[in-house]
């Protein structure tokens, strides 16, 4: 929808546009309006883009008006909330960003003979993207000075320049995502796809035997199984197999038999021949040991001359028994052969915590900072390491020690510095904590060490011209004198700033008052209302251009008047036999400078820009992906990060291209499985999976990779008449009418007589792009005044 | 006030096809999506299969994937189910859905607002 | 195919109130405020009575009100009336089901 808010009014004398007071009468002294304001309201046409306004025509885009909301002057600004201010346009159809605005204010008659009259109108074209933000506009011309701000909002849920791109955020089957700010899907967590409506399994799940509907799930295939159901199952019963596919059981090597459960290679699984006899195999779970001499039994286990190999370590003696041998080991050892080291500590001998390191026969203990001796049973003496640091000195105590701490210090080891600071600043002051004291440091205006001295800053008399001096907290503060003003009132009031004279007079400064010169033409206090000079003085034509009037405002007692036939964009010269020729202001051109010169002659818009004439200058509407006063800088569309799972962007005109990595496909690498999705090809346009990347056919009036660009093809032929200029607008197009001319297609005449340009009953005769006013018997001039 | 109107049920031998149709009107049909939900004699409602509002999206159930097509005519206001290779457990009463939309913590979710009065499919030799 | 559970049947007299339960899992009605009510009268449309487990379509008499605890959704019919005999059944939205909602498997009411 389009917002407009009216901000404020300053309509200082009560006036109509066409001279008039709303309430009626003048007062004869002041040329005052007097009796009752204008019961101002405002009326709002909102149309497409034209560089010359024209009044009429339809409001394309829509029209609305306020309810009277204020007198002659009001001010809005702060009123937040108040409805009665605002217009609200909605539109159904795509925004085009540029457009036309006609404000205008008027007057209420309050009844329904007499007709509302116009105050002032204001009229704005330009181009407006969607935004919370207001963009305020001064009416700064005529009778009345108005001032309004107007914003272009989406509604929810749509977005994009245009308020054409839908994005409704989801949480349910059919889709799991949020909006972006550029109506972009992003999937919640563990979702993917165009529509975020698969779930993405857990990391690793096979995606031929695994699947899932919920994230992080992996639910396997029958036959498969695992976490990553990226295991077959084997044949149940299967003891020494596997499978390379669900329900096989192929054997490991040296197994044999359908379950793979019989051992072909016995002597090499068991080993079951000891005292380095041979072993051979005779059949499944089957082997034979061959032993060597003094060796006997199944396993070669009984030892015919046991001692002869001296089993015993660590200087253990041996003794042949009937079984084999027996160890007698030597002190700290025990076990068959004399291996083990026996564990002297246990049970733990250390005193005091202390930890217990076995040795052989015998232990060490490591004992904590506080204890020493063979199991921690003495107190040590920790002041021999210095541990005090700011104290007059160190005492050993069993077990501690303690640190007689300097004044200010605190702690163990007397290295914390105690905090003098216990709030005996005042007035806000800082403290700062010092070893054994502290500092106040004073907020401005305040002294003492504890800040508690207001500083009297009128001591010094600052006052001047008799001003009498109050003293405040860190600042004075001067009462002047009437006749003084300023901080030190050492200024005399200067009753002409800012100036209140109008239209150029002078202004004088008095003691009390001030004084206006007014220029001839005006007259009043503040030189605001304009003299009639008819009342006093006749005319004379001079020539073609000029007439004299009789004046006490110059030397000669004449004045001239420069006659306005040029229009406002010219100057009048006149030429012998009663002719005239028009001296043109820049920019225009024609008999009357009524002709806006064509700026746009040049082609100045760049890279497909279209451009739309101004006065003296011109202005380029781009195509779609480049900005720029000539359209010369391609938009960058990766500066909202859009390749995801670390695809890399690259800027196109108006697009962008994703190179995607690690298998991620589509737009914007976000898919597993497809190049395509509903938002691959803008437009209409439909997509083709092409294996590792995608082409999108576009319809009628779109191009590009994405069928992002639109074809010049709405404007050609160029549908705007008489002089118009074409603005592709997707797949239809805006005309920017010349002067002139109006209508959607620039085939209406502009009324030039509206509103009323001639005076006095003079008929108004309409041409293009001009006016003459044919005036009533008596009357003369280009408007019959 | 919104109408839904199913058609095209009937009596079908087994492997035949059949093609349902629901005219909808009383509301923007184009801007939502629709459904076809199922109840056989007996038991309770299945949801059958359903598509977005522009029909570019379609989503079935898996008992009936492969056979069955949902379609949609925004021109015409018009829903369609093409029911091929039909089995006896396909008989039910089929009901025509209008998906609304609410809001929960920021985020929307659909939900069967309108129904049609149904129509009876029965497939048996 | 159904897998929210209702009672069959469910009976009052004129006036007073009636109460019918929906129990599910934590996956659909425990675990997401998706829940919707709806009566049938046999050769008729369905109609929404209740959605978002507690709101009420705008004609809907405010009779009929729905809450939630746990697993279960509840449907209570206040001063129940005869033009209140019809099937209701309950539906919701599970994360790990196939289908975008699934319903409850009905509860035939009576007004004795």
């Known amino acids: 929808q389009f917002e407009l808010e009216i901000l404020s009014m300053q309509n200082v004398n009560g006036e109509l546009q066409n001279g008039n007071c709303c309430g009626g009468a003048r007062n004869p002294g002041d040329r005052k309006c007097t009796r009752d304001e204008c019961d101002t309201y405002f009326k709002v046409c909102l149309k497409e883009y034209q560089s010359r306004v024209t009044a009429g025509g339809p409001c394309s885009f829509g029209s609305g008006s306020t309810p009277v909301i204020g007198g002659n002057t009001f001010n809005l600004k702060a009123s937040r909330g108040n409805d009665r201010n605002r217009i609200v346009l909605p539109f159904s159809f795509a925004w085009p960003r540029s457009y036309t605005l006609l404000v205008e204010a008027w007057d209420s008659s309050n009844d329904t003979v007499q007709p509302d009259s116009i105050i002032e109108k204001a009229s704005h074209s330009g181009m407006i993207n969607p935004s919370r933000q207001w963009q305020t506009l001064k009416q700064n011309t005529g009778v009345a000075h108005f001032e309004y701000q107007i914003r272009v909002t989406c509604d929810d849920y749509y977005y994009g320049f245009g308020c054409n791109k839908f994005c409704r955020p989801r949480d349910d089957f059919f889709g799991h995502y949020a909006c972006d700010q550029n109506g972009n899907k992003t999937c919640m967590e563990g979702w993917m796809g165009p529509e975020c409506n698969r779930a993405i399994c857990r990391q690793g799940c096979s995606p031929k035997h695994g699947s899932c509907k919920l994230p992080g799930d992996c639910r396997c295939q029958y036959g498969w199984q695992g976490l990553y159901c990226d295991k077959c199952i084997p044949h149940p019963g299967c003891v020494h197999g596997i499978c390379n596919e669900p329900w096989q059981c192929l054997c490991e090597t040296n197994w044999g038999g359908q379950l793979c459960d019989k051992d072909l290679n016995y002597c090499g699984t068991h080993q079951p021949c000891l005292n380095g006899g041979t072993c051979s195999n005779t059949g499944p779970d089957k082997y034979q040991c061959s032993c060597p001499e003094g060796y006997s039994g199944p396993n070669c286990e009984i030892a015919e001359h046991a001692c002869l190999s001296d089993p015993c370590h660590n200087r253990g003696s041996c003794k042949e028994t009937s079984l084999g041998f027996e160890c007698e080991c030597s002190p700290g050892w025990t076990g068959p052969t004399c291996s083990t080291n026996i564990d002297d500590c246990s049970p733990n001998n250390c005193s005091h915590g202390g930890t217990c390191q076995d040795l052989v026969n015998g232990f060490k203990c490591v004992c904590p900072p506080q204890w020493t001796g063979k199991t921690c049973q003495l107190d040590a003496n920790e002041c021999e390491a210095k541990p005090c640091v700011n104290a007059k000195s160190c005492k050993n105590l069993i077990a501690s020690y303690y640190c007689d701490c300097l004044p200010g210090w605190m702690g163990q080891n007397c290295d914390i510095n105690i905090n003098d600071c216990l709030g005996q600043c005042q007035n806000d002051a800082s403290c700062r904590d010092l070893v054994n004291g502290y500092r106040c440091i004073c907020p401005p205006g305040y002294a003492g060490d504890h800040c508690e001295r207001d500083i009297d800053e009128c001591a010094s008399n600052p006052c001047l011209n008799g001003g009498h001096c109050q003293n405040e907290i860190n600042r004075f503060q001067c009462l002047c004198p009437t006749g003084f003003s300023g901080n030190l009132c050492q200024l005399d009031i200067d009753y002409c700033e800012p100036n209140p004279c109008q239209n150029g007079a002078q202004c004088y400064n008095r003691a009390s008052d001030y004084f206006c010169k007014c220029p001839e033409d005006y007259e009043g206090k503040n030189c605001s209302h304009l003299k009639d000079h008819c009342r006093t003085t006749p005319c004379e034509v001079i020539d073609s251009c000029t007439v004299a009037m009789a004046s006490n405002d110059t030397p000669e007692g004449v004045r001239y008047i420069s006659s306005n036939v040029c229009g406002p964009h010219g100057k009048c010269k006149s030429q012998s036999g009663g002719k005239f020729t028009c001296d043109c202001n820049k920019g225009f051109t024609g008999t009357y400078c009524h002709e806006n010169i064509n700026d746009c002659e040049s082609n100045p818009c760049r890279n497909g820009g279209t451009c739309i004439d101004g006065v003296n200058s011109y202005k380029c509407i781009c195509s779609d992906g480049w900005e720029g006063a000539y359209c010369e800088t391609n938009i960058n569309d990766c500066s909202q990060n859009p390749c995801h799972n670390g695809g890399t962007c690259r800027d196109l005109v108006n697009d962008f291209y994703c190179d995607c990595k690690n298998g991620w496909k589509g737009k914007t690498c976000h898919s597993r499985d497809s190049q395509c999705d509903e938002a691959t090809c803008n437009n209409g346009g439909t997509c083709y999976d092409e294996g590792d990347a995608f082409k999108c056919m576009c319809p009628g009036g779109w191009e590009g990779t994405t069928c992002n660009i639109a074809r010049n093809s709405s404007c050609l032929p160029n549908p705007c008449h008489n002089g118009g200029t074409c603005v592709v607008n997707g797949e239809s197009f805006t005309c920017v009418c010349k002067e002139g001319w109006e209508g959607p297609i620039c085939a209406q005449n502009t009324n030039d007589c509206s509103p009323h340009p001639c005076y006095n009953s003079g008929t108004c005769v309409d041409g293009d792009n001009w006016y003459r006013c044919e005036c009533a018997p008596g009357f003369a001039g280009p408007d019959c005044r | 006030q919104v109408q839904l109107v199913e058609s095209g049920g009937g009596l079908v031998q087994p492997g035949g096809s059949l093609r349902l149709s629901c005219a909808a009107s009383?509301?923007?049909?184009?801007?939502?999506?629709m459904s076809w939900v199922r109840q056989a004699p007996g038991k309770g409602l299945e949801w059958v299969s359903a598509i977005s509002g522009s029909g570019g999206s379609t989503y079935y159930a898996d008992s009936v994937k492969g056979r069955f097509t949902i379609s949609r005519d925004n021109s015409k206001n018009t829903l369609y189910l093409q029911m091929n290779s039909l089995r006896a457990e396909d008989t039910a009463v089929y009901y025509c859905?209008?998906?609304?939309?609410?809001?929960?913590?920021?985020?929307?979710?659909?939900?069967?607002?309108?129904w049609g009065q149904g129509t009876l499919v029965t497939v048996s030799s | 195919q159904s897998v929210l559970t209702q009672p069959p049947s469910a009976s009052g007299s004129p006036g007073q109130s009636l109460a019918i339960s929906c129990t599910g899992t934590?996956?659909?009605?425990?675990?997401?405020?998706?829940v919707s009510w709806y009566q049938h009268h046999p050769g008729k449309a369905p109609k929404l009575i209740i959605y978002d487990v507690n709101k009420r379509p705008s004609g809907v008499p405010d009779r009929f009100s729905g809450s939630k605890s746990g697993n279960t959704a509840s449907l209570t019919i206040s001063g129940l009336q005869a033009e209140d005999e019809a099937d209701y059944f309950c539906s919701s939205y599970a994360v790990n089901n196939n289908s975008p909602y699934f319903f409850g498997t009905g509860t035939k009411v009576t007004v004795l």
């Open positions: 859905a209008k998906e609304d939309l609410a809001m929960r913590r920021g985020y929307s979710y659909g939900y069967p607002g309108y």
């Open positions: 009383g509301f923007t049909f184009s801007s939502y999506a």
């Open positions: 934590s996956s659909d009605v425990g675990g997401y405020n998706y």
